[in-house]
């Protein structure tokens, strides 16, 4: 807390300029008018203030705006944003995407800080949903952003936003998140056809149920093994050998290299060995000939 002292004669700041870097903390407090600072915030970034001096400037703004800064000030905070606490940011009402971009730019190249997380949360809540332009912006700065959201938060993502998602944005998503995003992607891309559709939906297939995989197997999509390995095990298990062959196309040969890994391993255990042999890949571990297969899950559903 800076003591209240009178401003020395002739030192009263008429504008925010470079001369202020030579002011001591108490002089900044005494000689810089908070309203002047607020109207000339855009100049602060160009002046090499010390961290201590920035603390004083923040203090002046806090006094001027105890209920939270207006957006006209927030947009020009620049490096002063790094001085803000999540508690400060919770008082803000940020509605402009330009403001969000400006503040994210300040933090660029760093991990998502608690301040940035709070800012994004405030912004998205203010908009009511995670629209395409916002998602575009956030994933540009933080590719893993989408996967940092809970399934509940992801549910508010409108399908149009899915067009902005790149495959790498989904790299750290877990199955529960893909379960929410996949139906959104299906809705988003429903006006597309065949191979075009498959290219777009591919990254989201970790959330696809069996029925959809069966439908895709009729489309000659030639799914690669990397995508197949990310499918939900429970969605893959009911697929027949013929369906998997159709789904993978020429990539079916890759099953051999993955036969010890899920979901391939578990799928093999559910297939008749005779059927696996038709692939000619030497896959072993299927159900021997003459054994009766009881689908207990179906039995439970019927009882």
């Amino acid at each position: 807390e800076v003591e209240k002292t009178a401003c020395p004669s002739g030192k009263k700041a008429r504008e925010i300029d470079e001369s202020l870097i030579f002011y001591k903390k108490w002089e900044l407090e005494a000689c810089v008018d908070a309203a002047l600072l607020a109207t000339q915030m855009d100049r602060v970034n160009a002046i090499p203030f010390t961290y201590e001096q920035l603390d004083v400037l923040k203090h002046k703004l806090d006094e001027l705006y105890p209920q939270g800064y207006p957006e006209s000030v927030i947009q020009h905070l620049g490096y002063l944003f790094l001085k803000m606490s999540p508690e400060d940011i919770r008082k803000w009402n940020v509605t402009s995407l330009e403001t969000l971009k400006a503040l994210l730019e300040v933090n660029k190249g760093h991990e998502m800080s608690p301040q940035v997380a709070t800012l994004i949360d405030r912004f998205v809540k203010g908009r009511g949903q995670l629209d395409k332009d916002t998602l575009d912006t956030l994933t540009a700065f933080y590719p893993g952003y989408l996967c940092s959201l809970s399934p509940e938060e992801l549910s508010s993502v409108p399908p149009s936003s899915i067009w902005a998602v790149r495959p790498q944005d989904l790299d750290t998503c877990d199955p529960r998140q893909l379960d929410v995003l996949y139906p959104k992607a299906r809705l988003a891309f429903q006006n597309m056809n065949g191979s075009e559709y498959f290219v777009k939906i591919q990254s989201f297939l970790g959330g696809a149920p069996t029925e959809d995989l069966k439908a895709l197997s009729q489309q000659n999509v030639s799914m690669d093994l990397a995508t197949f390995m990310k499918l939900r095990t429970d969605a893959v298990l009911p697929l027949t050998v013929a369906e998997v062959q159709k789904l993978l196309g020429p990539h079916v040969e890759g099953l051999k290299a993955e036969e010890r890994h899920r979901p391939v391993r578990d799928w093999i255990l559910r297939q008749r060995q005779d059927d696996l042999d038709t692939l000619g890949l030497g896959l072993q571990g299927g159900i021997p000939n003459g054994y009766l297969v009881l689908d207990l899950s179906m039995q439970e559903a019927l009882s």
């Epitope: 409108p158 399908p159 379960d179 299906r186 429903q190 029925e211 439908a215 489309q219």
Partner: antibody
Framework: EVQLVQSGAEVKKPGASVKVSCKAS????????VHWVRQAPGQGLEWMGI????????TYAQKFQGRVTMTRDTSTSTVYMELSSLRSEDTAVYYC???????????????WGQGTLVTVSS | SYELTQPPSVSVSPGQTASITCSGD??????ASWYQQKPGQSPVLVIY???RRPSGIPERFSGSNSGNTATLTISGTQAMDEADYYC?????????FGTGTKVTVL
Amino acid sequence: EVQLVQSGAEVKKPGASVKVSCKASGDTFNRYYVHWVRQAPGQGLEWMGIINPSGVSTTYAQKFQGRVTMTRDTSTSTVYMELSSLRSEDTAVYYCAESRIPGYNNFAMDVWGQGTLVTVSS
Amino acid sequence: SYELTQPPSVSVSPGQTASITCSGDKLGDKYASWYQQKPGQSPVLVIYQDNRRPSGIPERFSGSNSGNTATLTISGTQAMDEADYYCQAWDSDTYVFGTGTKVTVL
């Protein structure tokens, strides 16, 4: 034959909420997407939103965002649509409809409930 | 917001062909569906994905979609075809229904 059976007619006061249910009979209901569509008296059809088979993913029409909630109880094969802050303009027949036709990019509504009349009046 | 426009009414004699149009910006780039609704009843899907017919729908119902217009054609129209018809398409984040067309069989 597959049927969607909806809950009975409701009369509500402005500002209240209504929760309409939609229960399937005759097939594995939990495999399909369910839409909700409404129709005001003498008016056309208006889509409200959709819920996926497992119930974890919903998409609502912008107009109803923040006012509508769709949920699913897979154990009873029932889908629910709750609309809050009711006003007189919400007086309508509310339909649930399923997308049962197979297809990776198809959401056509081929099985419909009988409709539930919700009247909002003071 | 996206809009689908249909003629309010279409009249047709029994046995003749009825054509109902549905206009929307670049509608041909989207899949169109058509629903039939008789008074006091729930809608019934008659065409999906532009031109596919669900099982149980008579062959006299057909559909097409290109440019800015989707068309539902009922050939050899019967008295039982008298109903309201709605087109529908997905745009951005919502399903949009057309304004509806009342088909009267004279």
